[in-house]
């Protein structure tokens, strides 16, 4: 096929494993500016689901700390402050994108990959399977 | 500190932007094989902090398509199946990675860029400022 | 030898459909977004529909929405274009292109190119 000629201020593609592998400029653009002053950084434990924020850590993928929230219960607070079994704390996932270094311990090398995280926890109604 | 001796199989680290440009291989690993077979999907119906998913679409975004939550209601949903606004929904935010082409005529050179998206809704207690 | 091959492009009449394909070989179509283009004689080639690596989500220009479909099917390596209710305006040859990742608007970001298929719509 045609191939048109490239740009020279571009990086280099001549690597032998292009197109599988990319240049990506870390110095990371932050979209968030405008973020909402009001943080989600207290819900965790005034959420009617509350929820613990355990630290996962790997030098070795890039952000290397993710923080993972567990459902503190597995029903929900009531307006008493007990744990009503008639509804349930579930975690709220999301796929994510990380960069995991490859070949290990190389310093400019990664591979893309794909995570599911638990970001927090929101109280449901259950499924009630009835037994005939 | 320490100097880690560098693996010899390691792409060429010389480019003059190094540390900030790295080389990627986009042949996604996925995590998420063993993932709870009790998905996430239906969570926003049934979370008493109910939320629409609205589709935030970029071409020229890696990946194009994120899915952000609105929470439906001010406040929650009671027993009754009522809004109380004694509680307040509100949106469990999470900083994600995605990759842009940069510079945008270059076919193999990406810079990360991180946004801030609402994944699900979880209902608070609300913080009441009493007025001396 | 990498290449991306166009085919299903003809002469038509005003109203009729065509069907183009596009085959990758050489490589994998994956992690790429594959585009369409046209060059109408004496035109600027246009970007006329790209389709994403990620999810599959279509993008067209004004002037071909609600009559073309863009779609792809990985497991053959190969990006099809859906022509409806074609116009004499639609005359053009017609590439595929294959860049990394995302759609873009800048032609020098698409990898690679196909030789590109007539299209003719005359009465």
């Known amino acids: 096929g045609i191939t048109i000629p490239r740009n020279p201020g571009c990086p280099n593609s001549e690597d032998k494993n292009f197109p599988r592998t990319v240049m990506v400029n870390l110095n990371i653009h932050n979209r968030n500016t405008n973020t909402n002053p009001k943080r989600s950084s207290d819900y965790y434990n005034r959420s009617t689901s509350p929820w613990n924020l355990h630290r996962n850590e790997d030098p070795e993928r890039y952000p290397s700390v993710i923080w993972e929230a567990k459902c503190r219960h597995l029903g929900c607070i009531n307006a008493d402050g007990n744990v009503d079994y008639h509804m349930n704390s579930v975690p709220i996932q999301q796929e994510i994108l990380v960069l995991r270094r490859e070949p290990p311990h190389c310093p400019n090398s990664f591979r893309l990959e794909k995570i599911l995280v638990s970001v927090g926890c929101t109280c449901v109604t259950p499924i009630v399977h009835h037994v005939a | 500190g320490i100097t880690i001796p560098r693996n010899p199989g390691c792409p060429n680290s010389e480019d003059k932007n190094f540390p900030r440009t790295v080389m990627v291989n986009l042949n996604i690993h996925n995590r998420n094989t063993n993932t709870n077979p009790k998905r996430s999907s239906d969570y926003y119906n049934r979370s008493t902090s109910p939320w629409n998913l609205h589709r935030n679409e970029d071409p020229e975004r890696y990946p194009s398509v994120i899915w952000e939550a609105k929470c439906r209601h001010l406040g929650c949903i009671n027993a009754d199946g009522n809004v109380d606004y004694h509680m307040n929904s509100v949106p469990i935010q999470q900083e994600i990675l995605v990759l842009r082409r940069e510079p945008p005529h270059c076919p193999n050179s990406f810079r990360l860029e991180k946004i801030l998206v609402s994944v699900g809704c979880t209902c608070v207690t609300p913080i009441v400022h009493h007025v001396a | 030898e990498v290449q991306l091959v166009e085919s299903g492009g003809g002469l038509v009449q005003p109203g009729e459909s065509l069907r183009l394909s596009c085959k990758a070989s050489?490589?994998?179509?994956?992690?790429?977004?594959l585009g369409w283009f046209r060059q109408a004689p004496g035109k600027e080639r246009e970007g006329i529909s790209c389709i994403t690596s990620s999810d599959a989500s279509a993008y067209y220009t004004d002037s071909v929405k609600g009559r073309f479909t863009i779609s792809r099917d990985n497991s053959k390596n190969t990006v099809y274009l859906q022509m409806n209710s074609l116009k004499t305006e639609d005359t053009a040859i017609y590439y595929c292109a294959a860049a990394l990742l995302t759609c873009s608007s800048y032609y020098d970001a698409y990898t690679y190119w196909g030789q590109g298929t007539q299209v003719t719509v005359s009465s």
């Open positions: 050489g490589f994998s179509l994956d992690y790429y977004a």
